[in-house]
Amino acid sequence: QPSVSPGEPSPPSIHPGKSDLIVRVGDEIRLLCTDPGFVKWTFEILDETNENKQNEWITEKAEATNTGKYTCTNKHGLSNSIYVFVRDPAKLFLVDRSLYGKEDNDTLVRCPLTDPEVTNYSLKGCQGKPLPKDLRFIPDPKAGIMIKSVKRAYHRLCLHCSVDQEGKSVLSEKFILKVRPAFKAVPVVSVSKASYLLREGEEFTVTCTIKDVSSSVYSTWKRENSQTKLQEKYNSWHHGDFNYERQATLTISSARVNDSGVFMCYANNTFGSANVTTTLEVVDKGFINIFPMINTTVFVNDGENVDLIVEYEAFPKPEHQQWIYMNRTFTDKWEDYPKSENESNIRYVSELHLTRLKGTEGGTYTFLVSNSDVNAAIAFNVYVNTKPEILTYDRLVNGMLQCVAAGFPEPTIDWYFCPGTEQRCSASVLPVDVQTLNSSGPPFGKLVVQSSIDSSAFKHNGTVECKAYNDVGKTSAYFNFAFKGNNKEQIHPHTLFTP
């Protein structure tokens, strides 16, 4: 019995004065607690607790279930205990069959003994199966058998507590060990789509998938920079004992522009946390934005090809697209396709393929696109570069020599005089008059230039060259002169092609 110095409160004393007491089933249990400040007796075994306010605890006919710890407490909160074993050959174990173990922790198989003098108190597998090789345990007759460092592999392990009594092995009722996995990694989170674009009034619904080893993983949807509780719905699946999946679906039934923002799916367990975000953009109405991929003013050489390419953003998705030239709609030579196969894609590409363009095919080519909310268009001005062509070269009645040339860009006409029989005309002659004839309206077609010189300036036999040129090429026409006395005679003009 404990002893303390006088003046200090002392714990109660119990009779009989021993830490353990063994009685036989059917015998009397009589325990006396002596203390001036007696408060109560408490009996504990497994999860059961009983109290008695009498200082003498009497059980007339002891049963195995009276096995347990009897504690006497005084008004100072000091206590003293005695452990009573009620030996019952027919009931060697008291059991609480609920057996949960946390992975990597110890767990107690609660099968305390009613007789501490039996031997070989241990665990055995059910139906004669051996226990896992790495399973370690520590027996304690008053509490049960502690399994050390529970492994995930022990999940659903069937066990018995076992003792030897009079040379024979006696088994308790069976226990099934249910293992709670330890979190050894953060949850795996993913989202159905990384971004959403909606019109006002449409439903926003996004699903976050959380994967972990057990259902005790926590998850929630949060709005960035907001504490507002979001409405979410959960569904879950057990794909394996340690393979759990939850889907958390966030819904806004009628989205508004001010619902736009970043939403975070957050999950955490005892190991750590993980998150994934999705962006919501809500617009008051749909839109189309067109981006030309080439300059909208296009210059192309006669006979060459050109591709007119646009990219455009359209939301909702485009419903009608067309290319138009001179009020005619192209039925072929163009293609339209999404920029990506992504479900969230709003960007598209349209290409018009113009092949072997003629000088007459310059002009405005227009791309038109529409969706349920808006229409949009973009125009390309296509200029076809052509080598000058000399349309007319004449001596007029007033003695002027006139040369008319057409081409794009606008041709320049230079005049040269070649005296005598020289092949090369180098002496330039200044024109009297230069006019661009068709400058009214958009200059997509060939530009016509007229240039004139005064033939009276020529006093010798020779050749006059009219040379029309631009960035693409040049063409010449020639006037041959011969003098007979005082009369000037024009020999037939002719052209020479100069590539």
């Epitope: 249910k178 259902s215 879950s236 057990h238 004992d241």
Partner: antibody, heavy 118, light 107 residues
Framework: EVQLLESGGGLVQPGGSLRLSCAAS????????MSWVRQAPGKGLEWVSL????????YYADSVKGRFTISRDNSKNTLYLQMNSLRAEDTAVYYC???????????WGQGTLVTVSS | DIQMTQSPSSLSASVGDRVTITCRAS??????LNWYQQKPGKAPKLLIY???TLESGVPSRFSGSGSGTDFTLTISSLQPEDFATYYC?????????FGGGTKVEIK
């Protein structure tokens, strides 16, 4: 010994509300998911709702979604079911049960009767 | 949602008989199939979880088997205390759902 004790049942008019409680003892309450299951008179069992051990995540049967709310107070070892907009078809014995999808519902309370009638 | 269909809805048997109850899921539910026993006026009691694991304290005459969509509860030798209603339940995916029940009566 694991014990679950439901309370809060009774007679309520259609459209009314009721809050059921389930007091738990004999185990570490916060370690276990908890469910409500109901049984209409003479009928089979119907799972109603489940809440995770931490209380952070909840699940509902379609028949009660938006009307019933499951919650728990781990400091008081108590599970709750707030039932709003009650209908005649919600008349049943309501059981609380311990457990999750992996190990089944291993402990049940004795049930509390909810009668929805005008 | 996964529907659970139990058959038969009721059966009559004698003590000592071997009794088999089947449960079919509307889609595959791996092994997450539980069986419960309920006696009149009492709460259900878990017999078997995860298709075939006997809950502690449940007599070994009860056994469960099956996989995918088809599952079976077998009572190898019916005892007087086994006359009750039996329910299957899937806990593979929420919402968890029960079968309609099988009432085992005395012949």
């Amino acid at each position: 010994e694991v014990q679950l004790l439901e309370s809060g049942g009774g007679l309520v008019q259609p459209g009314g509300s009721l809050r059921l409680s389930c007091a738990a003892s004999g185990f570490t309450f916060g370690n276990f998911a908890m469910s409500w299951v109901r049984q209409a008179p003479g009928k089979g069992l119907e799972w109603v709702s489940l809440i995770s051990g931490s209380g952070g995540n909840t699940y509902y049967a379609d028949s009660v979604k938006g009307r019933f709310t499951i919650s728990r107070d781990n400091s008081k070892n108590t599970l709750y079911l707030q039932m709003n907009s009650l209908r005649a078809e919600d008349t049943a014995v309501y059981y609380c049960a311990r457990g999750d999808g992996v190990n089944g519902f291993d402990y049940w309370g004795q049930g509390t009767l909810v009668t929805v009638s005008s | 949602d996964i529907q659970m269909t139990q058959s038969p809805s009721s059966l009559s048997a004698s003590v000592g008989d071997r009794v088999t109850i089947t449960c079919r899921a509307s889609q595959s539910i791996p092994t997450y199939l539980n069986w419960y026993q309920q006696k009149p006026g009492k709460a259900p009691k878990l017999l078997i979880y995860a298709t075939s694991t006997l809950e502690s304290g449940v007599p070994s005459r009860f056994s469960g088997s099956g996989s995918g969509t088809d599952f079976t509860l077998t009572i190898s030798s019916l005892q007087p205390e086994d006359f009750a209603t039996y329910y299957c339940q899937q806990t593979y995916s929420t919402p968890y759902t029960f079968g309609g029940g099988t009432k085992v009566e005395i012949k």
